[in-house]
Interface confidence: medium
């Protein structure tokens, strides 16, 4: 027997049902008694699911698993994960035995978008020229880790004073702060780009700063 | 449609200061990048400088010592003020939209040239 | 400043032939984003430049497909498929990474 998976990762959002498909070719006269299919973690060997004896034996991975049982006679042996969480992501085995036996790994990418940031200004008020300003971009509950850019009004990139931090809460999914130093005078429209590797998606914030002329010598 | 439209004297004598205006219809100037750039006889391009939309400017060092890009925002107009000219400031000048994410320099002007001859 | 270099001051082509343009820079113009900071502009004779390219292979609003732009980090192609009376004009080249932007000297596109 000959089993057959996508070479690609799959790709799942956090919280979404994921597929990940498996297909071998049952010969003629082929009966689910015959069959004995096993998912299992390919690292740890842990057992998700298993169908064997004639009978779906269910999940052995926190009753998130199923089967296509309908599908199982024509050589579907496709497995169901519900609510994908962060945990899920890595390698999964499916073993298909008939009379010979067969086995292929295929890998689950877990994704989460990252929120459209808020831009923080400090301080955000009195600004004069000359003046050292932090601005601060978040986004929140993305996975995995972002990349951040930062740029100008005009699409220049820029990668001076850049601090980012990017800490994971409970569920895994990271809430990305980063912090761009400029001195005001080099006023202008900033841009913050956190970009989601693996879903190719971008979450644009930005801001206009605005400086008050000064004038000298300070008036009282 | 975003247009551009440069407009001042044609000749300026040497030592003398250079002046042109930029006026913007479609667009405000307080939304995107305003720049200048100079394209020399025998074709080559330079650029010079850009002021913001919130009003800050930069200029290419080159010209740092002699250049001002200063705008009126109630005319929707940015202007271009370059000092002690000399017969190298002989050229065609454009002004161009920055673009923000999709690409630079979609919208230029014409172009005036502007001679400095004695 | 970043150096944009154009080695060929004019190429003369016949319509319906494909031509291709080279631009080198002093510097990569990748930046960490995967953008590549390479535009290339057309000015025809009496015109003011026209955006072709941006980002070295994005095709610019109202372009005919037979231009497109390629690339590594310093070495850049554009290339004309298919050639019209058109096309005619000296083709620039711009970096976009870093102020101040810089251009080639420009290569000039003549019939045949």
């Known amino acids: 027997v000959e089993v057959q998976v996508s070479e690609d990762p799959v790709v799942a959002l956090v919280d979404t049902d994921a597929t990940l498909r498996c297909s071998f070719s049952p010969e003629p006269g082929f009966s689910l008694a015959q069959l004995n299919l096993i998912w299992q973690l390919t690292d740890t060997k842990q057992l998700v699911h298993s169908f064997t004896e004639g009978r779906d034996q269910g999940s052995a991975y926190s009753n998130r698993t199923a089967l296509f049982p309908d599908l199982l006679v024509q050589g579907n042996a496709s497995l169901r994960l519900q609510r994908v969480r962060v945990t899920d992501e890595g390698s999964y085995t499916c073993f298909v035995s008939i009379q010979d036996f067969d086995s292929a790994a295929v890998s689950l990418q877990v994704a989460a978008p990252y929120s459209k940031p808020s831009m923080t200004l400090e301080p955000n008020k009195d600004l004069r020229p000359g003046n050292m300003v932090t601005i601060t971009c978040s986004s929140y509950q993305g996975y995995p880790e972002a990349e951040v850019f930062w740029k100008d009004g005009q699409g220049v990139p820029l990668t001076g004073n850049v601090t980012t931090s990017q800490m994971a809460n409970e569920r895994g999914l990271f809430d990305v702060h980063s912090v761009l130093r400029v001195v005001l005078g080099a006023n202008g429209t900033y841009s913050c780009l956190v970009r989601n590797p693996v879903l190719q998606q971008d979450a644009h914030g930005s801001v206009t700063i605005t400086g008050q002329p000064l004038t000298f010598p300070p008036e009282a | 449609e975003v247009q551009l439209q440069e407009s001042g004297p044609s000749l300026v004598k040497p030592s003398q200061t250079l002046s042109l205006t930029c006026s913007v219809t479609g667009d405000s100037i307080t939304s995107a990048y305003w720049n200048w750039i100079r394209k020399f006889p025998g074709n080559k391009l330079e650029y010079m400088g850009y002021?913001?939309?919130?009003?800050?400017?930069y200029y290419n060092p080159s010209l740092k010592s002699r250049i001002s890009i200063t705008r009126d925002t109630s005319k929707n107009q940015y202007y271009l003020q370059l000092n002690s000219v000399t017969t190298e400031d002989t050229g065609t000048y454009y002004c161009?939209?920055?673009?923000?994410?999709?690409?630079?320099?979609?919208?230029w002007g014409q172009g005036t040239l502007v001679t400095v001859s004695a | 400043d970043i150096v944009m270099t154009q080695a060929t001051p004019s190429v003369p082509v016949t319509p319906g032939e494909s031509i291709s343009i080279s631009c080198r820079s002093s510097k990569s113009l990748l930046h960490s984003n995967g953008n590549t900071y390479l535009y290339w502009f057309l000015q025809r004779p009496g015109q003011s430049p026209q955006l072709l390219i941006y980002?070295?292979?994005n095709l610019a609003s109202g372009v005919p497909d037979r231009f497109s732009g390629s690339g590594s980090g310093t070495a850049f192609t554009l290339r004309i498929s298919r050639v019209e009376a058109e096309d005619v004009g000296v083709y620039y080249c711009?970096?976009?990474?870093?102020?101040?932007?810089?251009f080639g000297a420009g290569t000039k596109l003549e019939l045949k």
């Open positions: 980002r070295m292979s």
């Open positions: 002021i913001s939309n919130s009003g800050s400017t």
């Open positions: 711009m970096q976009h990474l870093e102020y101040p932007f810089t």
């Open positions: 161009v939209r920055g673009e923000r994410y999709y690409g630079y320099g979609a919208y």
